[in-house]
């Protein structure tokens, strides 16, 4: 057991150009937290992965306010260590993510929010028990610097803090075998009671009652050395003497997965298959419950009353992720129908919609026509959010109020002259041309292509449109 | 600023189920979660449920088995239904509009009464 | 479910003095999610604070609210008559949402 220990030493802009804007403004005050989050070994998993080593999350640093004009400086940070202790040993490597918190402070939606501000994440061999070790690391345009360290809890002590500690027995020295607990010389290495029998050269053990086998090494008592002559089977019958695998207990023997977890033998060693809630080597580490405020923004933790029964979180509007974290741009998600423009205005959400529709999100479409005439005569029709009149002859616009100039539109084909008249449009065709619009040639020979033409009028003559 | 008025029955039998209406004076209802909560004469208040217009909800797990939360946009109302009702459930109901920073409860209705009797 | 308590149970005072309500939760109200209403007779509650410590719109700055984990604390100023009414916390850190019994607040 131990603690791994993380200082932060400062936050802010990195060099070169292209300085961050501060986090925090007059009308916007700030407060930066951090969150660390440890995994074991050279993971390289998503920020989302559980925290199988453990999580920690730092108070709230000092409140801040830009100084108008003034770059963004190293930012205030909140007193103390992180601490993220481990229960079993330490692995020696592992990966953490560091993620720099902002709690904004103004009022403008009633209360505090908070954003993640950079996130920062790597892998690294570590000693416990050795000194700080210093880091920085960018990401974007700020750069945090921090060190870390991990260290056991006594009794634990050495790199993995595995070794047990115990008061010397004697005032001088150590019992028969036994070495001093460096760095606490007043103390002396106390023997873990292995397994009975557990070879002392070739064995070790990391729990008490249990016999592991270094390398090239097998059996119970790990007394047999691992030949690579041939055997009936890879753990088939044998002897000591043959120097094959006997059929001793396999790593998954008395179930090394705590917390109901399934064992699987792999190559090396072991893998767990861990029940919902808990994590790590054995399944010993515990996920996150609704006890440890996951929810951020005013999120609501439901379930998760049990390290066994995962957590979600209810995000009030406006926020969204596994914890509320992130910000959402509603607009984005084009709630507005019928062409109604979006306002997110933080604590709500509202639509303006266009002339002929309603609701929340303009999905209800109005009776166009209610209550709406045209004039001169004019037919409402009802379509796309407004109404529409459809005017009688001689009349336009949108209500049918203006008189219409029939001969705007170049209705006589073939250069036919246009003429307005009190009901309609005449027109007068060119040579060679007849009909309403002008449309039909006149055949050579004087015959049209249409019926012969009405008593009084000439081809050519101007043809009345009625 | 928006109003909230509770409706329904004022009495209700015995193993009979309670219904009631609450009507939101605006078009907000889509922006907000909406809640429900009772409180019995001279007691304290209890949350029931709430409600979101995407479909999620929550409920009270002692009630939850007896209740149903649901909501209309098209009319701006939710609602609530308490099945089986006993002499116990008789309390003032509120529906209220859920705080759009975190689940306290910014704006009330009145309150109906509801008596259980047969 | 987080049990409040709230204490006294209730708190004879004279206008103008200072009242001093509490709410203890059975486990820790995470990120200082909580609540506080007034209640007048024969009325709907009032929202006066919310994250423990934030005074809700057009709520008198008479009305204080502090504390943090389980401890929290509802601090009326300088009480004016029309503060003599029951007040109630509540949690919303984790659900269910509960609320604490009340704390009646009358003239002595």
């Known amino acids: 057991a131990g603690v791994f220990e993380l200082q932060i030493h400062s936050f802010g802009p990195g060099p070169g150009p292209g300085a961050p804007r501060s986090p925090c403004s007059a009308r916007l005050p700030c407060r930066l937290f951090f969150r660390v989050c440890l995994k074991p070994g050279l993971s390289e998993e998503a920020a989302e992965s559980p925290c199988a080593l453990g999580a920690a999350l730092s108070a709230r640093g000092p409140v801040y306010t830009e100084q108008p004009g003034a770059p963004a400086p190293d930012l205030p940070l909140p007193d103390g260590l992180l601490q993220v202790p481990f229960r079993d040993a330490w692995p020696g490597t592992f990966s953490f993510i560091i993620e720099t918190w902002r709690e904004e402070l103004g009022d403008q939606i009633g209360g505090p929010a908070w954003s993640l501000l950079a996130r920062v994440a790597g892998r690294r061999r570590l000693a416990a028990g050795g000194p700080w070790a210093r880091d920085i690391q960018r990401a974007g345009a700020w750069e945090l610097r921090f060190s870390y360290r991990a260290r056991c809890e006594p009794p634990a002590v050495g790199t993995a803090c595995t070794r047990l500690c115990r008061p010397r027995s004697a005032p001088s020295r150590c019992g028969p075998g036994l070495r001093p607990c460096a760095p606490l010389e007043d103390e002396c290495e106390a023997p873990l009671v292995c397994r009975a029998g557990c070879s002392p050269e070739h064995g070790f053990c990391e729990q008490p009652g249990e016999c592991r086998c270094l390398e090239g090494w097998t059996g119970p008592l790990c007394t047999v050395p691992v030949s690579t002559s041939s055997c009936l089977s890879p753990r088939g019958p044998s002897s000591a003497t043959t120097g094959c695998l006997v059929p001793g207990p396999g790593p998954c023997d008395g179930n090394p997965c705590a917390n109901g977890g399934s064992c699987s033998e792999t190559p090396r060693s072991f893998e767990c298959t861990c029940p919902r809630g808990f994590y790590g080597l054995r399944c010993e580490v515990s996920g996150v419950t609704c006890a440890d405020g996951p929810c951020f923004n005013g999120g609501l933790c439901v379930g998760g009353a049990d390290p066994d029964s995962a957590y979600i979180c209810h995000c009030p509007p406006g926020f969204q992720g596994s914890n509320c974290e992130k910000r959402v741009d509603r607009c984005s998600l084009q709630p507005c129908r019928n062409g109604g423009l979006c306002l997110d205005l933080g604590h709500a959400l509202r639509c303006r919609c266009r002339a002929g529709f309603a609701g929340p999100r303009c999905e209800h479409d109005l009776d166009d026509c209610a209550g709406r005439a045209c004039a001169n005569g004019g037919t409402c029709v009802e379509g796309g959010g407004a109404h529409r009149c459809s005017c009688a002859l001689g009349f336009g616009g949108r209500d049918c109020r203006e008189r219409a100039d029939p001969c705007a539109a170049r209705p006589c084909a073939h250069g036919g002259r246009c003429y307005a008249h009190f009901s309609g449009l005449v027109c007068a065709c060119a040579p060679g041309y007849m009909g309403a619009r002008c449309e039909f040639p006149v055949h050579p020979d004087g015959a049209s292509a249409l019926p012969a033409a009405p008593p009084g009028l000439r081809p050519g003559d101007p043809q009345r449109y009625l | 600023q928006v109003q909230l008025q509770e409706s329904g029955p004022g009495l209700v039998k015995p193993s009979e189920t309670l219904s009631l209406t609450c009507t939101v004076s605006?078009?907000?209802?889509?922006?907000?979660?909406w809640s429900w909560i009772r409180q019995p004469p001279g007691k304290g208040l209890e949350w029931i449920a709430y409600?979101?217009?995407?479909?999620?909800?929550n409920y009270n797990p002692s009630l939850k088995s007896r209740v149903t939360i649901s909501l209309d946009t098209s009319k701006n109302q939710f609602s609530l239904q308490l099945s089986s009702v006993t002499a116990a459930d008789a309390a003032v109901y509120y529906c209220?509009?859920?705080?759009?920073?975190?689940?306290?409860?910014?704006?009330w209705g009145q309150g109906t009464m509801v008596t259980v009797s047969s | 479910e987080i049990v409040l308590t709230q204490s006294p149970g209730t708190l004879s005072l004279s206008p103008g003095e200072r009242a001093t309500l509490s709410c203890r939760a059975s486990?820790?109200?995470?990120?200082?999610?909580l609540a506080w209403y007034q209640q007048n007779p024969g009325q709907a509650p009032r929202l006066l604070i919310y994250g423990a410590s934030s005074r809700a719109t057009g709520i008198p700055d008479r009305f204080s609210g502090s504390g943090s984990g389980t401890d929290f604390t509802l601090t009326i100023s300088r009480l004016e008559p029309e503060d003599f009414a029951v007040y109630y916390c509540?949690?919303?850190?984790?659900?269910?949402?509960?609320f604490g019994g009340g704390t009646k607040v009358e003239i002595k």
């Open positions: 486990q820790r109200v995470s990120n200082t999610y």
């Open positions: 209220a509009r859920v705080f759009h920073w975190g689940f306290a409860f910014d704006i």
């Open positions: 509540q949690q919303y850190g984790t659900s269910p949402l509960t």
């Open positions: 605006d078009n907000s209802i889509s922006n907000y979660y």
């Open positions: 409600i979101y217009y995407s479909g999620t909800t």
